[in-house]
């Protein structure tokens, strides 16, 4: 054995954005012949573990949200830990509104600004484009989030949603905004 074992990957199925009350499975993907898998929930003051390669959460609750990582053991050697997975509970707060300025129909080459507004004094907003697994844009901390999209191209066409949350509870998000369809005309 030379050096640490390669790290596994930790995935959330069907998604790491989980509406309250919905099911989710965390799965640690590594060698099938590993002697032992360990899944940790990394919470300051309450770091906890189970010796499994999966965690099934039948009903997502607020206390399930947070950061997770996993490792495996082979012949008494431990792997490097997986990258941390952020499991986010959505629907904790009511949805923000998402709008496009000057319009959601925009010719190529023009600028459009997507604005996410919450009824709460949240300092974090995130924008998702349908079909993408990662956030499309994440602005700095603004109470009213403007997501500038510069020089619109056909690739910017699509359906967008935003979420809002507080930086003091970064894994508890609002419900998604109603979808906003951006059409690049011409």
């Amino acid at each position: 054995q030379h050096g640490p074992l390669p790290k596994p990957s930790l995935q959330a199925q069907p998604s790491s954005l989980v509406p309250l009350g919905h099911p989710v499975t965390l799965r640690c993907l590594g060698p099938s012949d590993a002697d032992l898998y360990r899944l940790e929930k990394v919470k300051p003051g309450k770091l906890i573990f189970i010796d499994q390669d999966f965690l099934f959460i039948p009903i997502m609750e607020i206390n399930n949200a947070g950061r997770y990582r996993c490792s495996y053991q082979n012949e008494s050697h431990w792997s490097l830990p997986s990258d941390q997975l952020e499991l986010i509970a959505t629907g904790v707060y009511s949805k923000p509104s998402l709008s496009a300025h000057p319009s959601s129909a925009i010719p190529p080459g023009r600028d459009v600004t997507l604005k996410c507004q919450s009824q709460y004094s949240f300092d974090e907003f995130v924008l998702y484009k349908e079909g993408d697994t990662r956030p499309y844009k994440r602005p700095e901390k603004w109470y009213r989030a403007n997501f500038p999209v510069i020089t619109v191209t056909a690739a910017h066409s699509g359906t967008y949603r935003c979420y809002s949350f507080s930086s003091s509870s970064p894994y508890l998000w609002s419900a998604p905004s109603d979808p906003l369809v951006v059409v690049v005309t011409g």
């Epitope: 300051p44 309450k46 770091l47 906890i48 573990f49 490792s71 431990w78």
Partner: antibody, heavy 123, light 112 residues
Framework: QVQLVESGGGLVKPGGSLRLSCAAS????????VSWIRQAPGKGLEWVSA????????QYAESVKGRFTISRDNAKNSLYLQMNSLRAEDTAVYYC????????????????WGQGTLVTVSS | QSVLTQPPSVSGAPGQRVTISCTGS?????????VHWYQQLPGTAPKLLIY???NRPSGVPDRFSGSKSGTSASLAITGLQAEDEADYYC???????????FGGGTKLTVLG
């Protein structure tokens, strides 16, 4: 109430063997991780080995790997430490300790300790 | 040599405040693992004093408090009493080999 009682310590010659036992009561033994922790005379605490509730997950400190074997019998509410190829530096009080648990999750700290059993390795 | 570093001894007069430090590394305390503290009175087994960096089990006086920052932690004892004279150990977990690690222990002497 939770109780852990160690036994099996004694005087043994270098290269010899000894088997320690820890009798648990007052809790659902098979649900908990348990560890052996030792303390050489006048020295600090050293974690030795841990075992998961079912007995399939075991871990050892580098200093005892290949010489000590941890096991458990949940039907008897008992934890064991088989110590082979003993050395003078294994002389210590050996404690068994329970890891705290909540729902399905285990914690990395020890909430209950036994009173310890003394192992002396000397010729 | 212990993975976590503690001062070998501290002392204080009755009623005073003392702190005991516990320094680790990026693979244990700095990897997100909590720090726990145990008190060992002379001739007895260790007893859990602080868990999860700053939490006290029931029965532990609020004169004992813990904190964690970065790769280190500390235990504070206020209003020192003669019965606090004991050895104190910090404990955490190490990510590299998934082993439990202790500090070398600190002997607290209550003067006078």
């Amino acid at each position: 109430q939770v109780q852990l009682v160690e036994s099996g310590g004694g005087l043994v010659k270098p290269g010899g063997s000894l088997r320690l036992s820890c009798a648990a009561s007052g809790f659902s033994f098979g649900d908990y991780y348990v560890s052996w922790i030792r303390q050489a005379p006048g020295k600090g605490l050293e974690w030795v080995s841990a075992i998961g509730g079912s007995g399939s997950a075991v871990q050892y400190a580098e200093s005892v790997k290949g010489r000590f074997t941890i096991s458990r019998d949940n039907a008897k509410n008992s934890l064991y430490l088989q110590m082979n190829s003993l050395r003078a530096e294994d002389t210590a009080v050996y404690y068994c300790a329970r890891h705290y648990r909540e729902f399905r999750w285990h914690y990395y700290y020890f909430d209950y300790w036994g009173q310890g059993t003394l192992v002396t390795v000397s010729s | 040599q212990s993975v976590l570093t503690q001062p070998p001894s501290v002392s204080g007069a009755p009623g005073q405040r003392v702190t005991i430090s516990c320094t680790g590394s990026s693979s244990n305390i700095g990897a997100g693992y909590d720090v726990h503290w145990y008190q060992q009175l002379p001739g007895t087994a260790p007893k859990l004093l602080i868990y999860g960096n700053s939490n006290r089990p029931s029965g532990v006086p609020d004169r004992f408090s813990g904190s964690k920052s970065g790769t280190s932690a500390s235990l504070a004892i206020t209003g020192l009493q003669a019965e606090d004279e004991a050895d104190y150990y910090c404990q955490s977990h190490d990510l590299g080999a998934h082993v439990w690690v202790f500090g070398g222990g600190t002997k607290l002497t209550v003067l006078g």
